[in-house]
């Protein structure tokens, strides 16, 4: 399944919007830094693009879920957040078509499911952190920076797989 060219552009726009959403300096939040344990290997050890796509879909779905809570709405600029939702929604649509097309073509579907579970657990850790920090501005800034990093890593890995094929 070939993702449209606009998908890569969408990923870049998503990162740009995440950067624009920054409200405070991360340097003022150093005491709140946290290692969420991004499961990078779940994107790196999937040798086929068809196996990575459902995991990337899960990643974007979880980002969408995280930023569409009422706590998130209170933390970020509404206009930027709306644009961010639109970009994520478009990417989910692109990937969904590939997920459906790719059903049954993966070498080990259970491996893919374990990867999806690893991504879900990563977002559980992020949600728990926000809850423990009472959704403070610094907590949200730490999470925004973390999502930028992990989203960038996952899309880069997916792009490198695409160029190998």
């Amino acid at each position: 399944c070939d993702l449209p060219q606009t998908h890569s552009l969408g990923s870049r726009r998503t990162l740009m919007l995440l950067a624009q959403m920054r409200r405070i300096s991360l340097f003022s939040c150093l005491k709140d830094r946290h290692d969420f344990g991004f499961p990078q290997e779940e994107f790196g050890n999937q040798f086929q693009k068809a196996e990575t796509i459902p995991v990337l879909h899960e990643m974007i779905q979880q980002i969408f879920n995280l930023f569409s809570t009422k706590d998130s709405s209170a933390a970020w600029d509404e206009t930027l957040l709306d644009k961010f939702y639109t970009e994520l929604y478009q990417q989910l649509n692109d990937l969904e078509a590939c997920v459906i097309q790719g059903v049954g073509v993966t070498e080990t579907p259970l491996m893919k499911e374990d990867s999806i579970l690893a991504v879900r657990k990563y977002f559980q850790r992020i949600t728990l952190y926000l809850k423990e920090k009472k959704y403070s501005p610094c907590a949200w800034e730490v999470v925004r920076a973390e999502i930028m990093r992990s989203f960038s890593l996952s899309t880069n890995l997916q792009e490198s797989l695409r160029s190998k094929e």
Epitope: L110, M111, L117, R120
Partner: antibody, heavy 117, light 113 residues
């Protein structure tokens, strides 16, 4: 504490349908995959199918396709197995199991279904 | 579908003995991407649901005693109990965790003399 609580025993007439439930506590079903497994008296284990409650995607063993329907309700943290038009072959213990980390790592206590007129 | 053949069907042993049971797959359960064998072992005691013992052919589930060891690669797998205890009386099933439909072996029944 992770637990899967299944509904009670069912006596079903051949051709009628029955819906079994499996309620999770200690975790959110939408973060996992829920499987259903059948075990006939003194027999081995047969995989029926599974659901990803986050999106409703299901997979079935071809032998159960059309005979079993797996659904989930994330608001009540419950997964369901509906058996349609069972025959005496449907008499078995039905287990739900979750894939929280790896493989089927948590199991319900099982629901006994007896198909008899 | 992947077929799993377990042997022997029944094992009768004395407490303290070492036992091994076999599970052979009709096709390789090795994933080339992460070099893991997608074979799982379950233990089912009388009147109880199955319990996960070993996943990825050799990784022991947390809380499982270290007398249980899984080994094997590709199509041939073994579950070893180094020193059988009375509480190990159960049926042991291997399961294909590699591809759908998931399939189970017919089981090996462990009896204590």
């Amino acid at each position: 504490h992770v637990k899967l609580q299944q509904s009670g025993a069912e006596l079903v007439k051949p051709g009628a349908s029955v819906k079994l439930s499996c309620t999770a506590s200690g975790f959110n079903i939408k973060d996992t995959f829920i499987h259903w497994v059948k075990q006939r008296p003194e027999q081995g284990l047969e995989w029926i199918g599974r659901i990803d409650p986050a999106n409703g995607y299901t997979k079935y063993d071809p032998n159960f396709q059309g005979k079993a329907t797996i659904t989930a309700d994330t608001s009540s943290n419950t997964a369901y197995l509906q058996l349609s038009s069972p025959t005496s072959e449907g008499t078995a213990v039905y287990y739900c199991a979750s894939r929280v980390d790896y493989a089927m790592d948590y199991w319900g206590q099982g629901t006994t279904v007896t198909v008899s007129s | 579908d992947i077929e799993l053949t377990q042997s022997p069907a029944t094992l009768s042993v004395t407490a303290g003995e070492k036992v091994t049971m076999s599970c052979k797959s009709s096709q390789s359960l090795l994933n080339s991407g992460n070099q893991k064998n997608y074979l799982t072992w379950y233990q089912q005691k009388p009147g109880q649901p199955p319990k996960l013992l070993i996943y990825w052919a050799s990784t022991r589930e947390s809380g499982v005693p270290d007398r249980f060891t899984g080994s094997g690669y590709g199509t041939d797998f073994t579950l070893t109990i180094s020193s059988v205890q009375a509480e190990d009386l159960a049926v042991y099933y291997c399961q294909n965790d590699y591809s759908y439909p998931l399939t189970f072996g017919a089981g090996t029944k462990l009896e204590i003399k």
